[in-house]
Structures are given as C-alpha cells and as structure tokens.
C-alpha cells in the first residue's frame, strides 16, 4: 500500500514538475528590466528564451522573436537545449510511469517489469529535473556575470547622438518557476526510485523445489533436506533425484494425485 502511494505521489509530483518546466520554457519573463519612464509612456522590457517583449503603461504589449537577431550567444542556445531535453525526458518518463503504476493493470505484466519501468521513469525524472535546474541556473549566471548592469555610454555617430538606456537586468518569474519545477521533477523521480525498491519481488537465497514422483512409491535419498533448502553444497539446485525432483524453473505442471510439494 505504501509502495503504491509513494509511486502515485511520485508520478503526480513529477507531472506537476514537468508541466512547470514546459511553462517556464515558454514564458517570456526570464529576465526583466527596470521600468523606465519615457516622457510619452512608461515602458517595461522583459525577455525570454525565444522572444523579447515590451509592455507599455497603456497595457499594450509587443513581442518579437529572436530570429532577427544577428548573434545569439552559445549560452542561450545551451539553455534552450537543456530545457528541451528536460521536457523530452520528462515526457517519456511520464509515459513510461503511467504503464508502471501499480494501480493500473495491463495484461499480465509482472511486478518485476513494473519495478524496472518505475526505476527507468524515476531516473528520467531525475535527469529531467537536473536539466531544468541546470538550464535556469546557467541563465541566472549569465544575467549576474554579464548583463546585470548595462553601462550607460554615449557616442556621436553620423546620425546624431546614441545613448545606451541604463537598464538593470533582474531575475524574471520564469527563473523561479523553472527552479521549483525542476526541484519537483527531481523529488518525483527520487520517489519513483524509492517505490521501485518496494515493487521489486524480494530475492531469497533459495529456490523452491517441487518434487514429482515418477511412480507410486517415492524414495527420498539422504541429503534431500540439504539439497532442497540450499544448506548443502548443492546450492545451484541441480537435480539430485532420479525420481523426478526438478527445480522450479524446469518444472512442468502435470496435475496428478501423486504430486508432492
């Protein structure tokens, strides 16, 4: 019961996390710039992974994609890649974990298969969460190291004076969404891995041996106890009776009134 709860909770937490990673990746507010007052209207600039937006005090918002930019830094491309990898891994993990859920019956799927699938999805969620956290952290580091404060400089060109508008880049909402979502996906993945341990059938140090008598009279040879319990030298459960003792792996079940287990 606890295993099912852990697995289910892990799935739900990961689902919320991956939804958050998708939301963060699509959001425009990865970096925001201090609102500056133009004599005409107050302008608020913010930028995402895919486009840059401007919001005016009137409420008008205009966004433009980065395809017109001449040079996108490799770091931005790396962040994009990390977030997409995180989403893809998370989506695959979700798909696998749906079939791995203990509460869902699919044919005659064994617990060992479900345990393997749970572990696989758990690992995928962990990697997905790490990708998201890494992507957001790299972006945050870019803001802090390179673009936190743009220098106000002036130069005079052919067309008059050009002045850099003093803007301070601050962390946008998407960064916080990404960190939280990545963390949730990571936690969900860990929970799935924990649930996997409970799902896996416990391996014992012996294998059950069933005895099928070949005739009406059953002759037990000395040493049978040792052989059947794994205490003797015959730990591999080799056949020791000519009378038809077989390991569980070899046994073929023929219903008979002479079967003894």
């Amino acid at each position: 019961m606890a295993v099912t709860a852990c697995q289910g909770l892990g799935f739900v937490v990961s689902l919320i996390g991956i939804a958050g990673i998708i939301a963060a990746t699509c959001m425009d507010q990865w970096s925001t710039q201090d609102l500056y007052n133009n004599p005409v209207t107050a302008v608020f600039n913010y930028q995402g992974l895919w486009r840059s937006c401007v919001r005016e005090s009137s409420g008008f918002t205009e966004c433009r994609g980065y395809f017109t930019l001449l040079g996108l830094p490799a770091m931005l491309q790396a962040v994009r890649a990390l977030m997409i990898v995180g989403i893809v891994l998370g989506a695959i993990g979700l798909l696998v974990s749906i079939f791995a859920l203990k509460c869902i019956r699919i044919g005659s799927m064994e617990d060992s298969a479900k345990a393997n699938m749970t572990l696989t999805s758990g690992i995928m969620f962990i990697v997905s969460g790490l990708c998201a956290i890494a992507g957001v952290s790299v972006f945050a580091n870019m803001l802090v190291t390179n673009f936190w404060m743009s220098t106000a400089n002036m130069y005079t060109g052919m067309g008059g004076m050009v002045q850099t508008v003093q803007t301070r880049y601050t962390f946008g909402a998407a960064l916080f969404v990404g960190w939280v979502a990545g963390g949730l996906t990571l936690i969900g993945g860990v929970m799935m891995c924990i649930a996997c341990r409970g799902l896996a059938p416990e391996e014992t140090n012996y294998k059950a041996v069933s005895y099928h008598a070949s005739g009406h009279s059953v002759a037990y040879k000395p040493g049978g106890f040792k052989a059947s319990t794994g205490f003797g030298s015959n730990t591999k459960n080799k056949k020791i009776y000519d009378g038809g003792a077989r390991t569980e792996d070899e046994v073929q079940s023929y219903p008979s009134k002479h079967d003894y287990v």
Epitope: S31, Q33, N38, V40, T41, V43, N45, Q47, S52, V54, E56, S57, S58, G59, F60, E62, R64, Y66, T68, L69, L70, G71, L72, P73, L76, F147, S150, G159, G160, M161, V162, Q163, T164, V165, T167, Y169
Partner: nanobody
Framework: EVQLVESGGGLVQPGGSLRLSCAAS????????MSWYRQAPGKQRELVAG???????RYADSVKGRFTISRDNAKNTLYLQMNSLRAEDTAVYYC?????????????????WGQGTLVTVSS
C-alpha cells in the same frame, strides 16, 4: 550602427504647413517610442510630440490641435504633420527613438537622436 535621419524642414510662412520625416536605419530589433523634440535658439530642448509602439501619443500643450504625429512601424519611420505654423515654432527639430539593437542578446536598449532639421517660420 543605428541612426536616425530627419528630413522635410525648411522655410515656411506663418499659417503654412510642413511634414517632417524621420527614418531609422541600422541593426534595429524593435522601436519602443519615437518622439519629436525641438530646440529654439537660446532655449532648452523640449518635447513636441511622441508616439509609442502601441499608438499612445503625447503632445506639448503649445502644439495640440495643430501638429499630428504618426509612425510606420514596417518602415521604421516617424512623421510630424505641422499645420497652422507660427513664428514661435521656429527651431531645430530632432527625432528621438528608444529602440532595441539587433546586434546582441539580451536585447540592448538605446536612446538615439537624429542630427536635426531646421524649421523656420517667417514671413
């Protein structure tokens, strides 16, 4: 390099009309606000009219009802239609734009000024 080039200035009689144009060129990602400023001899530079990307406009009280500002976003061009011109409108008219350069990321915002065009209202 981003630059603004004004045109359309000249000598006009009081009560006459003029249309100023300002073309933005260079590596422009987007333009937020475009404005017209003027500076009369011996006076401070003042805002005449401005227009945002969303169409929000602002006019100086002295030109309200006489001047009309407009912009063509596709051409990155700003216009100022000046009607009922008076002698006190004589000044050098400067084009100003708050724009984003397309040469870097994150997008860098610049305040760019044109070299100015002289408008003389005299009989």
């Amino acid at each position: 390099e981003v630059q603004l080039v004004e045109s359309g200035g000249g000598l006009v009689q009081p009560g006459g009309s003029l249309r100023l144009s300002c073309a933005a060129s260079g590596s422009i990602f987007s333009i937020n606000v475009m404005s017209w400023y003027r500076q009369a001899p011996g006076k401070q530079r003042e805002l005449v009219a401005g227009i945002s990307a969303g169409g929000t406009t602002r006019y100086a009280d002295s030109v309200k009802g006489r001047f009309t500002i407009s912009r063509d976003n596709a051409k990155n061009t700003l216009y100022l239609q000046m009607n009922s011109l008076r002698a006190e409108d004589t000044a050098v008219y400067y084009c100003n734009a708050d724009l984003a350069e397309a040469t870097s990321w994150p997008v860098r915002y610049l305040e760019v000024w044109g070299q100015g065009t002289l408008v003389t209202v005299s009989s």
